[in-house]
Amino acid sequence: DADMKGHFDPAKCRYALGMQDRTIPDSDISASSSWSDSTAARHSRLESSDGDGAWCPAGSVFPKEEEYLQVDLQRLHLVALVGTQGRHAGGLGKEFSRSYRLRYSRDGRRWMGWKDRWGQEVISGNEDPEGVVLKDLGPPMVARLVRFYPRADRVMSVCLRVELYGCLWRDGLLSYTAPVGQTMYLSEAVYLNDSTYDGHTVGGLQYGGLGQLADGVVGLDDFRKSQELRVWPGYDYVGWSNHSFSSGYVEMEFEFDRLRAFQAMQVHCNNMHTLGARLPGGVECRFRRGPAMAWEGEPMRHNLGGNLGDPRARAVSVPLGGRVARFLQCRFLFAGPWLLFSEISFISDVVNNSSPALGGTFPPAPWWPPGPPPTNFSSLELEPRGQQPVAKAEGSPTA
């Protein structure tokens, strides 16, 4: 079955997250500084005319670019789109930001700079104080906190109103650790690296982040082709060569937001065996409840049979037997020269009364609405009442 059952669709993950409609409270909007109380962070809501009509920082954003507006979404969200405006103030305002950068954090500790698929960090902003400019984030970011850093090319006043669009990140995946993806040499080089990974890379291992294996984009049957425009061959897949792994397997670790009962893992794999890509021969996963704890019980083993001759890409479902954990370590066994994955997702239920893993003393927030529903594998928030998702620009996945 090539279908990723319950798999979230990033194209539908485009709901306004609450700046304009005030479901994000003032207390969750802050800033590095404000010019005055009438241009404080709470006045940064899109289409709002509160105060003097926008957030304006006290300091100059040129040349340092250190001033920021911060929005705390309180829970992990997939943020797919942002919108910006300047300070209109009934026609009296003239301040806006022609460009800006974004930084985001899943936990209030480590901040990552958003970059597009080609490594560009600077986002084109507004050309006037009133117009709303929407920016499709390709890749989207999984974040709890988002910071907007307005830019300027000279000393000048800049002001900002914003909205974020996306959906709740129900999967609960905080990070995965994996070996760095490799390059396959055919008639042309096929780059099977995780090009949007936002963690660290040390000694051939990527850790502490999320990337293409959790971005909702499922690869095509021909791994040399892509869903994305203007990208390199192999873009949708992360791949590893059997020659580089004497153990005969690729090992990955997955970290989740809280204790969960895992029903299954779904791995979208390529099986273009004429070019060396094969489904894994089997998967073995082990489980633990905390970062410094021992792995618990026997590993879950799953052998993969089925129609390995069919060259189409497909989702492989690995049963996990309801095992309770916050950390999973899985070994994917080679059954051919290459393993190529485009997406890994989990069907899990939050274990009742397990508190969020984001420890410390951050201001408390409910991790779920009252009476948390099981995740049932969907990372997509149920459609907010009376809201429609923002449509995607036609023919341009990353416009």
């Epitope: 705390d72 936990d107 901040w111 040390v202 850790y207 502490g208 982040g209 970290e255 970062p291």
Partner: antibody, heavy 115, light 112 residues
Framework: SVEESGGRLVTPGGSLTLTCTVS????????MSWVRQAPGKGLEWIGI?????FVDYASWAKGRFSISKTSTTVDLKITSPTTEDTATYFC?????????????WGPGTLVTISS | ELVMTQTPASVEAAVGGTVTIKCQAS??????LAWYQQKPGQPPKLLIY???KLPSGVPSRFKGTGSGTEYTLTISDLECADAATYYC??????????????FGGGTEVVVK
């Protein structure tokens, strides 16, 4: 720069708050940590104030210390000091884009807990 | 809880010699390791970060190596000014759920 203040002689159980004052950089962009060193002993990490407002503590320090911040200071409150808390207390800044090491330290402030 | 075990507690070497200090973490810390030098009456000074990187101004005589749970600081061509106590510091951090930091017990380096 970073400078600690507030160190003094206090009796066990008495409340004590140390202040770390920073200049030349903004606490809205940098994370700050508290570290202590008992006389003739090694360094002990106490906790960290993230620029987002989040606070983490060493497991041994939870409940014994409280960290808070303003726009230019990071405070460390020793909730109910004992003689074991006698030490020099350092405030240290983390790297701008790397949260795993301390690249700027204050000179320290000495706290003596004695009856 | 992260525990950093540093050895030896003390080491003596001659000027021009080499000293090796080891640090073992109780958990895999993925090169999130720093080394500091501290002299009496002074705060620690950063020597190495990310297990092997030198901040500007630190001589290349100081070399950090290691990965996973095992790390080493090597000081070559010892100078009298290198007499100090050296500490390793590790961080355990996942993708957003847990942060812990700890120092090793320190190594006193005596230069003859």
């Amino acid at each position: 720069s970073v400078e600690e203040s507030g160190g003094r002689l206090v009796t066990p159980g008495g409340s004590l708050t140390l202040t770390c004052t920073v200049s030349g950089f903004s606490l809205s962009s940098y994370d700050m940590s508290w570290v202590r060193q008992a006389p003739g002993k090694g360094l002990e990490w106490i906790g960290i104030s993230w620029n987002s407002g989040f606070v983490d503590y060493a497991s041994w320090a939870k409940g014994r210390f409280s960290i808070s911040k303003t726009s230019t200071t990071v405070d460390l409150k020793i909730t109910s000091p004992t003689t074991e808390d006698t030490a020099t207390y350092f405030c240290a800044r983390l790297g701008a884009d790397d949260i795993y090491y301390f690249n700027l330290w204050g000179p320290g402030t000495l706290v003596t807990i004695s009856s | 809880e992260l525990v950093m075990t540093q050895t030896p507690a003390s080491v003596e070497a001659a000027v021009g010699g080499t000293v090796t200090i080891k640090c073992q973490a109780s958990e895999t810390i993925s090169s999130r390791l720093a080394w500091y030098q501290q002299k009496p009456g002074q705060p620690p000074k950063l020597l190495i970060y990310q297990a092997s990187k030198l901040p500007s101004g630190v001589p290349s005589r100081f070399k950090g190596t290691g990965s996973g749970t095992e790390y080493t600081l090597t000081i070559s061509d010892l100078e009298c000014a290198d007499a100090a106590t050296y500490y390793c510091q590790g961080c355990y951090y996942g993708g957003g759920s847990f942060y812990d930091s700890a120092f090793g017990g320190g190594t006193e380096v005596v230069v003859k």
